[in-house]
Amino acid sequence: SNNKRAPYWTNTEKMEKRLHAVPAANTVKFRCPAGGNPMPTMRWLKNGKEFKQEHRIGGYKVRNQHWSLIMESVVPSDKGNYTCVVENEYGSINHTYHLDVVERSPHRPILQAGLPANASTVVGGDVEFVCKVYSDAQPHIQWIKHVEKNGSKYGPDGLPYLKVLKAAGVNTTDKEIEVLYIRNVTFEDAGEYTCLAGNSIGISFHSAWLTVLPAPGREKEITASPDYLE
């Protein structure tokens, strides 16, 4: 189009929230969607001065096609006023956001309520337990099975017999450790499973039960209780 036009905001709804209070280590995204003819350019100021990549560790990203500024893993020194300046040869507009970085107190891990959930399956079936962990401090996660030895769930010291089924290792991602898969289930797999998450503040855990049912048409084969796990 030949209709020359100074810059204008195209989506003011996305710009209404001026104050952004964000926990440390989170990602912040500021948007200034605009139009104009010719297409305007966008630049960013921090506290009224040109915002340069070297002004913050890790720099920042500008997505021109989305009219956005993205800062990952924010720290307290990122606090301040961020102004987008959108301009072409016919004019200039600007909009300022205020960023507050909240240094949250690290807490013991929080596990999502209701997870892992009790499950049941037939012999030979597959089952999965899911555990969602929220932690400010880096958590270590384990899946534990409560087992029996010599017909007892507890040792002479009164402590339960436990078997670590899965633990976060060097090559394990958080997503991988959050799910425990049990394939080709047997009666011996029945019992209590615990998702444990710990960090430098403390440990939290949730448990769930797996019930194993006989496969259809195989009821008559079951004559004795399953062997105890060693």
Epitope: S105, P106, H107, R108, I110, L111, Q112, A113, A137, Q138, H140, Q142, I144, G158, L159, P160, L162, V164, T194, L196, G198, N199, S200, I201, G202, I203, S204, F205, H206
Partner: antibody, heavy 124, light 112 residues
Framework: EVQLLESGGGVVQPGRSLRLSCAAS????????MHWVRQAPGKGLEWVAV????????YYADSVKGRFTISRDNSKNTLSLQMNSLRVEDTAIYYC?????????????????WGQGTMVTVSS | DIVMTQSPDSLAVSLGERATINCKSS???????????VYWYQQKPGQPPKLLIY???NRFSGVPDRFSGSGSGTDFTLTISSLQAEDVAVYYC?????????FGGGTKVEIK
């Protein structure tokens, strides 16, 4: 027997530095977070710092942030507290305390074992 | 920070009588795992604190059953059902849910 033994305390002038150590025995040190807690003479208890089992995470009380550094050497079963720019108000008994372990626990997940403490006096 | 407020500052109780110490937190210590992370300690002169009660109401190993913990959310109580001479000490509550870990100011228990 599970034991924590602090050392390194003494009398020091304001602005100077001191390094405290805590020797752990009787448990798998490398599997536990560790804390420092202090107690000024005749006063209550104040948490100072914590370090995760592998040393990757450290947190401090605001009163010591930027001046104190917590560290550990798992090969020597030793916890340390480097105290710089000491102030008169840092005068206290410093206790080494065992924190949360890495595994399932029946009982408290830490803060069950305390050392005897080492006295730090900051005075001109 | 979570503030732990203990009361009374001191308490004089006759031998064999009940002693009750209160502790109030500025925010709930009930965690998503269903446990309430308040701990109680006993400290005698010249000694480090000794753990008495963990997770609101669980007695630590070796602690006499005259010591009990109770409460919910933000209000907690340590009770010594029948005070003995060896119970003379300062008692502290502590929150163990987030850093900075914080302690109550302490309650000094003496014999009347």
């Amino acid at each position: 027997e599970v034991q924590l033994l602090e050392s390194g305390g003494g009398v020091v002038q304001p602005g100077r530095s001191l390094r405290l150590s805590c020797a752990a025995s009787g448990f798998t040190f490398s599997s536990y977070a560790m804390h420092w807690v202090r107690q000024a003479p005749g006063k209550g208890l104040e948490w100072v710092a914590v370090i995760s089992y592998d040393g990757s995470n450290k947190y401090y009380a605001d009163s010591v942030k930027g001046r104190f550094t917590i560290s550990r050497d798992n090969s020597k079963n030793t916890l340390s507290l480097q105290m710089n720019s000491l102030r008169v108000e840092d005068t206290a008994i410093y206790y080494c305390v065992r924190g949360a372990g890495r595994g399932y626990t029946y009982g408290p997940d830490g803060f069950d074992i305390w050392g005897q403490g080492t006295m730090v006096t900051v005075s001109s | 920070d979570i503030v732990m407020t203990q009361s009374p500052d001191s308490l004089a109780v006759s031998l064999g009588e009940r002693a009750t110490i209160n502790c109030k937190s500025s925010q709930s210590l009930l965690h998503s795992d269903g446990k309430t992370y308040v701990y109680w300690y006993q400290q005698k002169p010249g000694q480090p604190p000794k753990l008495l009660i963990y997770e609101l109401s669980n007695r630590f190993s070796g602690v006499p059953d005259r010591f009990s913990g109770s409460g919910s959310g933000t209000d907690f109580t340590l009770t010594i059902s029948s005070l003995q001479a060896e119970d003379v000490a300062v008692y502290y509550c502590m929150q163990y849910i987030e850093a900075p870990l914080t302690f109550g100011g302490g309650t000094k228990v003496e014999i009347k």
